[in-house]
C-alpha cells in the first residue's frame, strides 16, 4: 500500500481540506520534471524560469546564458535549438498545432557569434519541421510537404524534393496514420551520425479515402477538414525511403533504399530508420498483416553512390501468437562494432527481453530473462547497457533503471534506482549525455516526482535538478486519497489493480465505486506514478472509491496476457473489468447499487461494452470519444490487433464487437456519451452511430458534444467536460451537490 504524502498528526487534521474540482481544473497540484537538453558528454542546456537559455557544465560547475530572454521575446519564441557547432540557434514561434505530434511554426536563425539574426535567405513560413545536422550547422526543413536543405543558415536552400502536395505526397513528414500509429513523431527524416547523408520517407496518400468533417469556426459557412485517413481494410499510404548526399544535395536524384523482397510482395509499412554509421543504415519494415517484421541493414556503395541491402543482413521477427512487438516493433540499439545490436523481443517463454544479435536472430543471445519484461534500452556504451524493466519486487507497474556490464564476462547486472528513494520513487525514466558520461533520472512516483543528476560511471547522485518543493508544501494541508496497488488471481489470470480510496476510508462502510478504464492493447493503467487529477478529487471530496484494472491485452506481463485479445477486441478487456468489479464487491466496502464505469477513447469503447454487458453491475457510465466499431478506426492500429474486415479474415468479429450491436442493453443503465466534433483520431462518426442505434432502439441516454474540439477536448472544453461528468456521477450516486 502506498500512502502519499505521509499524513500529519490528527491535531492538525482540522486545518486540512479535501481537493476541489477547481484545484484539478486549475492545475494547482501539477508537478515539474527536469530533462536536460544534452549538448555534450558533460554539458546541457536548460530554459530557466525567467526564460533565459542557460548552458551548464557539470564538470566545471559553471553556467552561463547563451541566449537571453530578451532575444527570445523579440520573436516571441517558445522553443529553441542550438546548432551542434554552437554558432547558431533556431528560435521557434507562432506554434500552430496540427495532429498529436505535428505542428507548424515560424523559425528565425540567431547567429551567436555576432549576436544578430541571420538576414538574407530567411526561412519560409510556416515550416512543418526543421532540424540541425548532427555536426556543424546544416539545416534540413520541410515546407509545403517538400524537403529543403541549407548548407549554412545564410545560404539559399537546395530543394531536395519537388513532388510534395497537400494531402497527397508527404516528404520528410508523416501523413496522419503514420504520425499517429507508426512513427509517433512529427518528422520522417533522419540525419546520418556525421551529417553526410539525410534519409527521408515519402508517403503517397493519393489513393487513400478521405475523412471529411465540419469545422464550424465563426464564419457563415463551416469549412470542411479533409484528411487522408485509411480505416480498417482501406487503401493504405505507399511509403518509400530515400537517401540524399548532403555534400552535394540535389545533384542527382535521391537514392531509394530497396525494400526486402519478402516485405515488398504484399502491402507493407515502414516502421523506423536507425543510422548505424555514416555509411550504414538500418530500416525496419512490417507486413500489413503485422506479425512479420524485417530489419534490414543497408550499406553505401561508394562506386555507384547507391544503397545496398544484402539478404544476409535481413533479420526477420515473427510472432505466431499475436502481432510483432508490443505496441510498436522495438528498435535496435547498435553496438560499437556497427553490425551487432541489442533489441527487445519475446523470448521462448513469451516475455519481452533484451537480446544481442550478432549474425542471425536465431542465434540471438538473451541478455535479460525472467517472468517480467525489459521495457526500454536507453543507451549502450563500450562497457555498459542501460535499460528499464519492471522486474523489481514483481510489480509490473513499476519502472527501474538497470545497468548491465557488457565489457566483462559474465555480464553483471545492477539496479541503479531500486533503492534510491524506495518509497517515493518506483517509476523512473532516464536521459543520458553523450557516451553516458552523466545521466538524469526522472522519478514519476508514487511520491512527489523528483529529477536528479548522476555520474554515469559511479551512479552517484550529483545534484537534485527538480524536487517540486512548492508542490510538496501546497499539498501539506490537502487530504489526498490513499492509493493501493494489489492483484487479483482469477482463473490463472493475474489482474493488477490500483484502488484510490477516500482519505477517511473505513472498510466497514459502503462506498460508491467508479471504474476508470482504458484497456487498449499494450497499455498499462496500473502504474506507480504520482497524480492529482479528477479521480483524486472524486475520492478526496466526493467519497468515491476509484479502481483501475489491467486486464487481458495489457502490457509488460508477458505475451499470454498481451496477445489474449488478438483478433477479438472488445471481449476479454470487458470481461476482466466485470470480473474485477465482482471481486471488489466481495471485499465488502462497495455499495453494489452505486457502481459506475468511465473511459476515454479505447476506454470509452470498453466502458460502453461493459455498460451493455447485461450484467446489471453498473448503474451508470460515461464514454468519452469512444470507438464504436473497429471498421471506423485507423488501419494501422486496428489491423494490428484485429486482422482485416474481410469475409475470409475477421469480418465476423468486426461486426460482433460494435457498440451499436448492443444498443438494446443500454436500456437499464444511465449512459453519458461525449465526443468532440473535430476529432481527427476517433471520428465523431463513432458516437453518431452509437446515438443513432440508441435512438433506433428507443433507448434513452445523455449526450454532450464539443464543437470544433479534437480527441483531447482541451482548453475550456476540459473544464466543461469534467464539471459535466462530475454532475452526472453525483446524480448517479445520489450525492448532494
Amino acid at each position: 500500500i502506498v500512502l502519499r504524502p505521509s499524513r500529519v498528526h490528527n491535531s492538525e487534521e482540522n486545518t486540512m481540506r479535501a481537493l476541489t474540482l477547481k484545484d484539478i481544473l486549475n492545475g494547482t497540484f501539477s508537478y515539474k520534471t527536469f530533462f536536460p537538453n544534452w549538448i555534450s558528454g558533460q554539458e546541457y542546456l536548460h530554459q530557466s524560469a525567467d526564460n533565459n537559455i542557460v548552458l551548464y557544465n557539470i564538470e566545471t560547475g559553471q553556467s552561463y546564458t547563451i541566449l537571453s530572454n530578451r532575444t527570445m521575446k523579440s520573436v516571441n519564441a517558445s522553443n529553441y535549438g542550438l546548432s551542434p557547432d554552437r554558432q547558431f540557434v533556431y528560435l521557434e514561434s507562432d506554434y500552430s498545432k496540427l495532429w498529436r505530434y505535428s505542428y507548424t511554426a515560424t523559425y528565425y536563425i540567431y547567429d551567436l557569434s555576432n549576436g544578430e539574426f541571420v538576414r538574407g535567405n530567411e526561412l519560409p513560413r510556416p515550416i512543418q519541421y526543421l532540424c540541425w545536422s548532427p555536426v556543424g550547422s546544416k539545416l534540413a526543413y520541410v515546407y509545403q510537404n517538400n524537403i529543403y536543405l541549407k548548407q549554412r543558415p545564410g545560404d539559399p536552400p537546395f530543394q531536395i524534393t519537388f513532388n510534395g502536395r497537400e494531402n497527397k505526397i508527404f516528404n520528410g513528414i508523416p501523413d496522419w496514420v503514420y504520425e499517429e500509429e507508426m512513427l509517433a513523431t512529427k518528422y520522417a527524416l533522419w540525419w546520418s551520425p556525421n551529417g553526410k547523408f539525410l534519409a527521408y520517407a515519402e508517403f503517397n496518400d493519393t489513393d487513400i479515402p478521405v475523412i471529411a468533417y465540419s469545422y464550424y469556426g465563426d464564419e457563415q459557412y463551416p469549412r470542411t477538414i479533409n484528411i487522408p485517413y485509411p480505416k480498417a481494410g482501406a487503401k493504405n499510404p505507399v511509403v518509400r525511403i530515400f537517401i540524399i548526399d548532403t555534400t552535394y544535395p540535389a545533384y542527382v536524384g535521391p537514392q531509394e533504399v530497396p525494400v526486402p523482397a519478402m516485405i515488398a510482395s504484399s502491402d507493407y509499412y515502414f516502421s523506423w530508420l536507425t543510422w548505424v554509421t555514416d555509411e550504414r543504415v538500418c530500416l525496419q519494415w512490417l507486413k500489413r498483416v503485422q506479425n512479420v517484421s524485417v530489419l534490414s541493414i543497408c550499406d553505401f556503395r561508394e562506386d555507384w553512390q547507391t544503397w545496398d541491402c544484402p539478404k544476409t543482413q535481413e533479420h526477420i521477427e515473427e510472432s505466431r501468437t499475436g502481432w510483432a512487438g508490443g505496441f510498436f516493433v522495438s528498435t535496435p540499439v547498435f553496438s560499437y562494432d556497427a553490425i551487432s545490436y541489442y533489441k527487445i523481443f519475446s523470448d521462448k517463454d513469451g516475455y519481452k527481453h533484451i537480446h544481442y544479435i550478432k549474425d542471425t536472430v536465431e542465434n540471438a543471445i538473451q541478455i535479460t530473462s525472467g517472468k517480467w519484461e525489459a521495457i526500454n534500452i536507453f543507451r549502450v556504451t563500450q562497457d555498459s547497457l542501460f535499460y528499464s524493466s519492471n522486474e523489481f519486487e514483481e510489480y509490473p507497474g513499476r519502472r527501474n533503471i538497470y545497468r548491465i556490464s557488457i565489457g566483462s564476462y559474465p555480464p553483471s547486472k545492477k539496479c541503479v534506482t531500486c533503492h534510491l528513494r524506495k518509497e517515493r520513487c518506483q517509476y523512473y525514466t532516464a536521459s543520458f549525455s553523450d557516451y553516458a558520461k552523466y545521466y538524469a533520472l526522472v522519478c514519476y512516483g508514487p511520491g512527489i516526482p523528483i529529477s536528479t543528476l548522476h555520474d554515469g560511471r559511479t551512479d552517484q547522485e550529483i545534484k537534485i535538478l527538480e524536487e517540486n518543493k512548492e508542490l510538496e508544501n501546497a499539498l501539506k494541508n490537502i487530504q489526498l486519497p490513499k492509493e493501493e496497488i494489489k492483484k487479483l488471481e482469477v482463473d490463472e489470470i493475474t489482474l493488477w489493480y490500483k484502488m484510490i480510496l477516500p482519505p477517511q476510508f473505513d472498510r466497514s462502510k459502503k462506498y460508491p465505486l467508479l471504474i476508470q478504464v482504458y484497456g487498449g492493447p499494450c497499455s498499462q493503467s496500473v502504474r506507480s506514478v504520482f497524480a492529482v487529477n479528477w479521480i483524486s478529487y472524486l475520492a478526496s471530496k466526493e467519497g468515491m472509491v476509484i479502481a483501475l484494472v489491467d486486464g487481458r491485452g495489457t502490457a509488460f506481463q508477458g505475451d499470454k496476457l498481451l496477445y489474449a485479445v488478438y483478433r477479438k477486441l472488445g471481449v476479454y478487456e470487458v470481461e476482466d473489468q466485470i470480473t474485477a468489479v465482482r471481486k471488489f464487491i466481495e471485499m465488502g466496502f462497495i455499495d453494489e447499487k452505486r457502481i459506475a464505469i468511465w473511459g476515454w477513447s479505447y476506454g470509452g469503447y470498453v466502458s460502453s461494452l461493459a455498460l451493455a454487458s447485461g450484467t446489471g453491475l453498473f448503474k451508470c457510465g460515461i464514454a468519452v470519444a469512444p470507438v464504436s466499431s473497429w471498421e471506423y478506426y485507423a488501419s494501422v492500429y486496428t489491423e494490428r490487433f484485429m486482422g482485416l474486415p474481410t469475409k475470409d479474415d475477421n469480418l465476423e468479429h468486426y461486426k460482433n464487437s460494435t457498440v451499436m450491436a448492443r444498443a438494446e442493453y443500454f436500456r437499464n443503465v444511465d449512459y453519458l456519451l461525449i465526443h468532440g466534433t473535430a476529432d481527427d483520431n476517433v471520428h465523431f462518426q463513432n458516437s453518431a452511430q452509437i446515438a443513432k442505434a440508441l435512438v433506433n432502439a428507443q433507448v434513452d441516454f445523455q449526450a454532450m458534444w464539443y464543437s470544433d474540439q479534437n480527441h483531447g477536448l482541451s482548453g475550456l472544453s476540459t473544464n466543461h467536460l469534467y464539471t459535466h461528468m462530475t454532475h452526472f456521477l453525483k446524480q448517479c450516486f445520489s450525492l448532494s451537490d
Partner: antibody, heavy 120, light 107 residues
Framework: QVQLQESGPGLVKPSETLSLTCTVS??????????WSWIRQSPGKGLEWIGF???????NYNPSLKSRVTISVDTSKNQFSLKLSSVTAADTAVYYC????????????WGQGTTVTVSS | EIVLTQSPATLSLSPGERATLSCRAS??????LAWYQQKPGQAPRLLIY???NRATGIPARFSGSGSGTDFTLTISSLEPEDFAVYYC?????????FGQGTKVEIK
C-alpha cells in the same frame, strides 16, 4: 541574364594537362543555389559529364575520369576551372561549362563550348 | 552506370509533322530525366526537365512523358528550327549520363 564563357588553349600535347576556365557573367558562382559543371562532347563518345563544383569547393567527378580531373573555383574572379591531366587523343572534344540546378531542373545555362585537340 | 538508349538514331520528317523520340534507361531513373536540343555549332539547350516539365521559354509544342525506364519527347508539329539533335540525360544515379542522341532531319 547569366552567361558562361569557356577559355583556354585549343591544342594540348598528349600526357600534358588540359586547363580550361569558365567565366560567369550576370550572376555569381558564390550563389548557393547552383552547381557549376563541365561536360564534353567528342565525336566518338557523345556528351559526357565530367564533374561539378559547388561554391564551397565541394566537387564530384565522373568515376571514369576521377583520377585525372580537378575542378576548382575562384569566387573573387567569378570563375571555375577544369584541369584534366595525362591527356590522350581520346580527350579531344568540345568542352562545355554549364550552370547546373541539380537533378530536377537540369543544366539550364551553357557556355558556347571550346574545342580542345590533343595532338603532338 | 545507367545506359540511356535513344531511338531512332535518325528521324526524317517534314515540317508540320509530329515527332516522337524515345529514350530507354537500363534501370529505373524515376522521373529524373531531362531532354536537350543541340543545333550544329551550338551548345545543348535545356528543353524538358523532370521528364515532363518545359524549361523557361520552350514552346508548348514540346512535351515530355514517361517515368521509370521509358521516356518520350514529342514535338507536336515540327517547325523548321526544330531540326536538330536531341539528347536525354538521367540524373537518377551517379554519374549523370546522356543518351547517344536522336537526329531529327528534314525529309
Amino acid at each position: 541574364q547569366v552567361q558562361l564563357q569557356e577559355s583556354g588553349p585549343g591544342l594540348v600535347k598528349p600526357s600534358e594537362t588540359l586547363s580550361l576556365t569558365c567565366t560567369v557573367s550576370g550572376g555569381s558562382v558564390s550563389s548557393g543555389s547552383y552547381y557549376w559543371s563541365w561536360i564534353r562532347q567528342s565525336p566518338g563518345k557523345g556528351l559526357e559529364w565530367i564533374g561539378f563544383i559547388y561554391y564551397s569547393g565541394n566537387t564530384n567527378y565522373n568515376p571514369s575520369l576521377k583520377s585525372r580531373v580537378t575542378i576548382s573555383v575562384d569566387t573573387s574572379k567569378n570563375q571555375f576551372s577544369l584541369k584534366l591531366s595525362s591527356v590522350t587523343a581520346a580527350d579531344t572534344a568540345v568542352y562545355y561549362c554549364a550552370r547546373d540546378r541539380g537533378y530536377y531542373y537540369g543544366m539550364d545555362v551553357w557556355g558556347q563550348g571550346t574545342t580542345v585537340t590533343v595532338s603532338s | 552506370e545507367i545506359v540511356l538508349t535513344q531511338s531512332p538514331a535518325t528521324l526524317s520528317l517534314s515540317p508540320g509533322e509530329r515527332a516522337t523520340l524515345s529514350c530507354r534507361a537500363s534501370q529505373s531513373v524515376s522521373s529524373y530525366l531531362a531532354w536537350y536540343q543541340q543545333k550544329p555549332g551550338q551548345a545543348p539547350r535545356l528543353l524538358i526537365y523532370d521528364a515532363s516539365n518545359r524549361a523557361t521559354g520552350i514552346p508548348a509544342r514540346f512535351s515530355g512523358s514517361g517515368s521509370g525506364t521509358d521516356f518520350t519527347l514529342t514535338i507536336s508539329s515540327l517547325e523548321p528550327e526544330d531540326f536538330a539533335v536531341y539528347y536525354c540525360q538521367q540524373r537518377s544515379n551517379w554519374p549523370p549520363t546522356f543518351g547517344q542522341g536522336t537526329k531529327v532531319e528534314i525529309k
